[in-house]
Interface confidence: low
C-alpha cells in the first residue's frame, strides 16, 4: 500500500489530525520536500543577521550579515566582525597587525611580509600594516657594471630599506 503522505507536495504537510490530508504549511513555516509530516519553522534573521532571502512555503529564509560583519559557518550560522585593512580579529576585537605583518583585506589574519633576501632580492618598497613589502631586483642587478661575483647583500629584516 502506498503511503498517502507521499502525495503531499513541498509547501504542505501530511496532517494526521485531519485524516492525512495535505494541509498548507502555516505562516512562518515551510516544507522543502514532499511527504513531510510536519513543516519546519522558518529561520528568523535578527540582530546582526539580515534577511537575504525571505522564507516561503517551500524554502527556508536565508540570512547574511549586516554591514561591518561577514558570514561564518554553514548557511551563515554566525556573523563575524569585519576589521579594517591593517588589522585582524582577535578574541578582544580588531587589533592592528604586529610589525612585520600585514593584512590587505577587511577580514582574515595578518601574515608576515615577504622576506626579499630569501630570494636574493632587495626591498624596493617597505611593507606596512596594510601592504606587503615589494621586492626589487637582486642587489647585483642594481649597477650595470656589477660583476657576477658580487657578494649577496647581507640579510635584512623584511620591510627595511637597503642601507
Amino acid at each position: 500500500l502506498q503511503d498517502p503522505c507521499s502525495n503531499c507536495p513541498a509547501g504542505t504537510f501530511c496532517d494526521n489530525n485531519r485524516n492525512q490530508i495535505c494541509s498548507p504549511c502555516p505562516p512562518n513555516s515551510f516544507s522543502s520536500a514532499g511527504g513531510q509530516r510536519t513543516c519546519d519553522i522558518c529561520r528568523q534573521c535578527k540582530g546582526v543577521f539580515r534577511t537575504r532571502k525571505e522564507c516561503s512555503s517551500t524554502s527556508n529564509a536565508e540570512c547574511d550579515c549586516t554591514p561591518g560583519f561577514h558570514c561564518l559557518g554553514a548557511g551563515c550560522s554566525m556573523c563575524e566582525q569585519d576589521c579594517k585593512q591593517g588589522q585582524e580579529l582577535t578574541k578582544k576585537g580588531c587589533k592592528d597587525c604586529c610589525f612585520g605583518t600585514f593584512n590587505d583585506q577587511k577580514r582574515g589574519i595578518c601574515r608576515p611580509w615577504t622576506n626579499c633576501s630569501l630570494d636574493g632580492k632587495s626591498v624596493l618598497v617597505n611593507g606596512t600594516k596594510e601592504r606587503d613589502v615589494v621586492c626589487g631586483p637582486s642587489p647585483a642587478d642594481l649597477s650595470p657594471g656589477a660583476s657576477s661575483v658580487t657578494p649577496p647583500a647581507p640579510a635584512r629584516e623584511p620591510g627595511h630599506s637597503p642601507q
Partner: antibody, heavy 118, light 112 residues
Amino acid sequence: QVQLVQSGADVKKPGASVRVSCKASGYTFTSYPIHWVRQAPGHRLEWMGWSNAGIGNAKYSQEFQGRVTITRDTSASTAYMDLSSLTSEDLAVYYCAREGVAGAFDIWGQGTMVTVSA
Amino acid sequence: DIVMTQSPLSLPVTPGEPASISCRSSQNLLHSNGYNYLDWYLHKPGQSPQLLIYLGSIRASGVPDRFSGSESGTDFTLKISRVEAEDVGIYYCMQPLQIPYTFGQGTKLELK
C-alpha cells in the same frame, strides 16, 4: 550563481609558457582573493600563489617563484596565471579558487589540463 | 613551510559505517583569534575539490551534517558518521595560516 570558469585544456612544448584564465561571476570579483592550485598525476594538491583581486598584488610559493605570474583584469572579472619555462613536471590540472572566509577555498574553477610534450 | 601529514592514505569503508581521517601539522595552527586554521576538502573523481570544513570544525555551506571536524593541538580529525556512496574521493587537509598554504598527501576513501 557564484562560479569560476577556466580556459580550456592546453598543450605546450617544453620551454614554452602557458596562460590559464579564470572568469568570475555571481559575486563582486574585487572583494575576494583568487588562488591557484595545481595537481600533477599521482601528487597532492599544490598551492602556487594568490592575487588580491582588489589591489592586484600577488604572492607566490617559493616553489614557483620566478616562473609564475598571477594577474587580474577587474573590468573582465578575470584572473590569469602565467607559468613559464615549462617542463614535463608541469603536466597537471590547474585550478583557480576563491578564498572565502578564513583562508578557505569556497569556490573552485573546473580545472584546466596543461600537457607539456615535445 | 608547514608540513601536513595525513593518515591513513587509503581507507576502505562499508556504506553506512563511520570513517575517520587524521591530519597532523608540523606547527601549531592556532591563531590568536582562537581559531585553528585548518580546512578539509573532498576531491571527487572528475570534479573540482570542494570545501567541507574550515577553521578546524566549521562545516561549509551545503555540507551534510554527517561530516564533522575536530582538533587537538596539532592533530586534526575529519569524521563521517555514516559513509554514503557519494562520499568516495580523496580527502585533503590544508593549512591557510602561513604562506605557502600546504596540503596533506590525501586520503583515498573507497567503498568495500
